[in-house]
């Protein structure tokens, strides 16, 4: 949904959320381009790109939250994701440098689409919370309570270490989105009913 617009139709909104999470768990949209741009596309280096434990809530944790708690957790986590993605973007090569290196500019464009897409998902999470009459969530167009911050990336002058941290974060992000999609897939046909 575009800024500020909320569908009042539960099934339509749930469908949008499922579609968005399906796209966001697809590694070809974010992790794979990041690996190529950062020169990590070598088997030995790929081995080091593992999800950091505890960086994102597990599927088990998400399932145990109930709808409102799940949406609140998702909203807060997406807030952190927006910051981490912006942080990654700051340290990506510039378009002209990519062209000089013979790397694909489309990979950079994919990476730069991630944040607006997360914003769109977060807006729909807010809309769903409104539909479920959850008054505890901050409207996405206004500043709200500070979202819990993730562990700050370890300050390091090691550019390679930073690249690996980015890679680990993105792997965790895709896994998290897969878990979110699975939770949404269990939601019932109406706001008042859940399939078990």
């Amino acid at each position: 949904a575009a800024m500020g617009s909320c569908s009042k139709e539960y099934r339509m909104l749930l469908g949008q959320l499922q579609k968005q999470t399906d796209l966001m768990q697809d590694t070809s949209r974010l992790l794979d381009p990041y690996i190529r741009i950062q020169g990590l596309d070598i088997p030995k280096l790929r081995e080091h790109c593992r999800e950091s434990p505890g960086a994102f809530p597990s599927e088990e944790t998400l399932r145990g939250l109930g709808r409102r708690g799940f949406l609140q957790t998702l909203n807060a986590t997406l807030g952190r994701v927006l910051h981490r993605l912006a942080d990654l973007e700051q340290h990506l090569p510039k378009a002209q440098d990519l062209e000089r290196s013979g790397l694909n500019i489309e990979d950079l464009e994919k990476l730069q689409m991630a944040r607006p897409n997360v914003l769109g998902l977060r807006n729909n999470v807010y809309c769903m919370a409104q539909l479920l009459d959850n008054s505890d969530m901050t409207e996405p167009t206004k500043a709200g309570r500070g979202t819990p911050q993730p562990p700050t990336p370890t300050p390091t002058s090691d550019v390679f270490q930073r690249k690996l941290e980015g890679c680990s974060f993105l792997r965790g992000y895709h896994r998290f989105m897969h878990s979110v999609g699975r939770v949404f897939s269990k939601w019932g046909e109406s706001p008042n009913r859940s399939r078990r």
Epitope: A2, M3, G79, L82, H83, L119, A143, G146, Q149, T152
Partner: antibody, heavy 121, light 111 residues
Framework: EMQLVESGGGLVQPGGSLRLSCAAS????????MSWVRQAPGKGLEWVAT????????YYLDNVRGRFTISRDNAKNSLYLQMNSLRAEDTAVYYC??????????????WGRGTLVTVSS | DIVMTQSPDSLAVSLGERATINCRAS??????????MHWYQQKPGQPPKVLIY???NLESGVPDRFSGSGSGTDFTLTISSLQAEDVVVYYC?????????FGGGTNVEIK
């Protein structure tokens, strides 16, 4: 009334350091990302740096990264800009601004009146 | 970095007439249904003041003679009926990516 008041500006020699402060009042400071924006005399506006609400994330203009450090103390409702290795081109009025809107896609809705930094020998 | 080109640099308009300021981005500042473009007014010796946020939303307390439109790379700030207090400098700002960048400014004068 929401207010931002900058201090710490002044005349400094090239290569020198200065620390700007911004005191916030009238709103819940810890709920907002904050930024520094500068304006060279008679020129346009230039974004310099932003810090997230909790202080964990910082974003910088390329030509100040490594020289400037943005920080905050939420307990004191204060924002800071530590400026090292200052250059003549850093001469400007430095404004403290509150960030609102979509996370990481903010705009600035409350501004201080600015503090003048002059870098000259 | 995204370069914001504002036009014209200076604009002379009669009081009560329409003033139109344009801002062109070197690449799109819109994505996923969002327009990350904002407009500011700056009076001499004062800090900037937000007029329009996210391309078309009027900031609270701003007169409704100000409006914004556009998407992608081209955006417009319109003052439907110029008042004496509107004769100042206007800037566009994008927040699509870091670094956020401002346009060079448009000085509005009375014809």
């Amino acid at each position: 009334e929401m207010q931002l008041v900058e201090s710490g500006g002044g005349l400094v020699q090239p290569g020198g350091s200065l620390r700007l402060s911004c005191a916030a009042s009238g709103f819940t400071f810890s709920n907002y990302a904050m930024s520094w924006v500068r304006q060279a005399p008679g020129k346009g506006l230039e974004w310099v740096a932003t810090i997230s609400d909790g202080g964990s994330f910082t974003y910088y203009l390329d030509n100040v990264r490594g020289r400037f450090t943005i920080s905050r103390d939420n307990a004191k409702n204060s924002l800071y800009l530590q400026m090292n290795s200052l250059r003549a081109e850093d001469t400007a009025v430095y404004y403290c601004a509150r960030d609102v809107g979509h996370t990481t896609f903010w705009y600035f809705d409350v501004w201080g009146r600015g503090t003048l930094v002059t870098v000259s020998s | 970095d995204i370069v914001m080109t504002q036009s014209p640099d200076s604009l002379a308009v009669s009081l009560g007439e329409r003033a139109t300021i344009n801002c062109r981005a070197s690449k799109s500042v819109s994505a996923a249904g969002y327009n990350f473009m904002h407009w500011y007014q700056q009076k001499p010796g004062q800090p900037p003041k937000v007029l329009i946020y996210y391309a078309s939303n009027l900031e609270s307390g701003v007169p409704d003679r100000f409006s914004g439109s556009g998407s992608g790379t081209d955006f417009t700030l319109t003052i439907s009926s110029l008042q004496a207090e509107d004769v100042v400098v206007y800037y566009c700002l994008h927040s699509r990516e870091f670094p956020f960048t401002f346009g060079g400014g448009t000085n509005v004068e009375i014809k």
